[in-house]
């Protein structure tokens, strides 16, 4: 139905959705002192500005009773539920922040007539994909998806001199949100990483996995799973692994690697980590208390929507333009803000491009080291370490297929 | 080890002025937002100031407005507040804190107004 949006006369008002089920388990009261930052901030910037304007975040949350499973299964009612509850209190602001979970994005952007921005810190699915009033700000699959394919075609570097067309994927369901849409998208038939691969298959099973790095016979050489060393140390532990295994450890939000006093466990030799540029804030190990860096990463996409908001209303003001219009809701994409970390750049669908790294374990420090990074807002790779120790034969990455040529 | 620590609290009277520092160590001082809150007696902590990690932004709650500067010199890792027209509703443990998370906390620095 149609909601008035309380979002003129120089008052704006952000609707915060507090979700029960989220994709990660964060304390709300934290995401709502992320909001007031944010809040905090986009106020001076207005001020600054000359815009004498009131903004302020409404927190709309859920009662809990029935959507109680505290992951995203349950989330799909929850997120329609809560806008029924905006719906019912006639109080909408000019932009809603809140859904995590793809399958409640996806379904309340299916329910409703979205004539205003939704922000997602999360929503990482295919699903949520080119959605025109939908923006994200944490790493989508599709993103990660580009890369893959992008890295496995690669055959004229130093350290990589063989395209890739094959790839195990481990998925045994147990993963956390963002892992669980990333594997999704590798798993899917009609995917482009699919589609660009010659062979595929998902390992659902530890025996499987397990069996594979010691397999003569496997089809690919090349395992791509996501989470952290340790959920790989559970999975291998210290197994023996074939001299041409090369495992892709998906673990984008996590910028322990980059600190000084890590060193690289023996079990991670075999692996490399694709995770994001720590950027601006790299937080050491005893710095964030209360939150792990992935828990960081998205109580700081909250705050970065607010900043994302402020940042389009001040061009709207300025421009004398109105903000209950389907241009402002439509104009979440395609520009590049002042984030809290610094800039955050969103592509033309209105998701966040990001710098991602490739680490190696070097044989020689046992430290993680960069061995290239990858721009998703131009799907380029850039080479860092053209000489890298690596445990591989020759300092090279093999072949995706044991015996076959050079390619 | 991260710590804050803050210094220059002292008892002035109304209208006099105040210079907090903080001392940071343990992280990139420079890659961080650093903020001022303050905790009145009997009440909760007051965001009062806060500023971006290279200077370029600073913000002020409005109580403060025109009477506050929040400043930093990244090369000695400080963070400064210098207040000026103390008033006695700015009586306060005055704290300084970084990042959004307010993860870590100095043991604050008092600062009394009163004639």
């Known amino acids: 139905s149609q909601v008035s949006q309380n979002c003129h006369n120089g008052s704006y008002e952000i609707s915060v959705l507090m979700m029960g089920n989220s994709a990660f388990a964060e304390p709300l009261k934290n995401l709502e002192d992320a909001v007031n930052e944010g809040l905090e901030i986009v106020r001076g910037r207005l001020q600054n500005a000359g815009l004498n304007v009131t903004v302020n975040a409404t927190f709309m949350y859920s009662d809990g009773l029935i959507h109680n499973s505290g992951d995203c299964r349950s989330s799909t009612c929850e997120g329609l539920d809560l806008l029924r509850k905006i719906s019912n209190a006639q109080r909408m602001g000019c932009v809603l922040i809140g859904p995590s979970c793809t399958y409640s994005t996806f379904q309340m952007y299916l329910d409703t007539e979205l004539s205003y921005p939704m922000i997602s810190a999360g929503s990482f699915g295919l699903s949520c994909d080119y959605k025109e009033t939908l923006t994200r700000l944490m790493s989508p699959a599709r993103k990660l998806m580009y890369f893959l394919v992008n890295f496995w075609k690669t055959n004229d570097l130093p350290f990589k001199t063989y395209s890739w067309s094959t790839s195990y994927v481990y998925k045994n369901g147990t993963e956390t949100e963002d892992c669980f849409w990333y594997l999704n998208a590798l798993e899917a038939s009609v995917s482009y990483f699919s589609h660009e691969l010659g062979f595929k298959v998902v390992l659902r099973q530890d025996k499987e996995f397990q069996d594979i790095l010691m397999d003569h016979n496997r089809k690919s050489n090349v395992i791509i799973m996501c989470g952290g060393p340790e959920f790989l140390y559970k999975l291998k532990g210290d197994r023996a692994v074939a001299e041409d295994i090369v495992i892709i450890l998906v673990d984008l939000f996590n910028d322990q690697y980059f600190e000084d006093n890590v060193t690289a466990p023996d079990y991670m030799k075999n692996v490399l980590v694709l995770t994001l540029s720590p950027g601006n804030s790299l937080l050491n190990s005893s710095f964030s208390r209360n939150l792990s860096p992935t828990k960081r990463d998205f109580a700081l996409a909250y705050l970065n929507g607010i900043l994302l908001f402020g940042h389009m209303l001040k061009i709207f003001l300025e421009n004398g333009e109105n903000i209950t219009t389907p241009k402002f809701a439509h104009a979440f994409r395609n520009l590049t803000f002042e984030g809290y970390d610094g800039p955050v750049t969103l592509d033309d669908w209105g998701d966040v491009d990001s710098t991602m790294v490739l680490l190696y374990t070097s044989v020689d420090t046992k430290k993680y080291k960069v061995l290239l990074t990858y721009d998703t807002h131009v799907n380029k790779t850039y080479p860092v370490d053209m000489s890298p120790t690596f445990t591989w034969k020759n300092s090279k990455l093999p072949n995706d297929i044991t015996g076959r040529g050079p390619q | 080890q991260v710590q804050l620590v803050e210094s220059g609290g002292g008892v002035v009277r109304p209208g006099g002025s105040l210079r907090l520092s903080c001392a940071a160590s343990g992280f990139t001082f420079s890659r961080y937002w650093m903020s001022w809150v303050r905790q009145a007696p009997g009440k909760g902590r007051e965001w009062v100031a806060k500023i971006k990690y290279d200077g370029s932004e600073k913000y002020y709650a409005d109580s403060v407005k025109g009477r506050f500067t929040i400043s930093r010199d990244n090369a000695k890792n400080s963070l400064y507040l210098q207040m000026n027209s103390l008033r006695a509703d700015d009586t306060a443990v005055y704290y300084c804190?970084?990042?959004?998370?307010?993860?870590?906390w100095g043991q604050g620095t008092t600062v009394t107004v009163s004639s």
């Open positions: 804190a970084t990042d959004f998370t307010r993860d870590v």
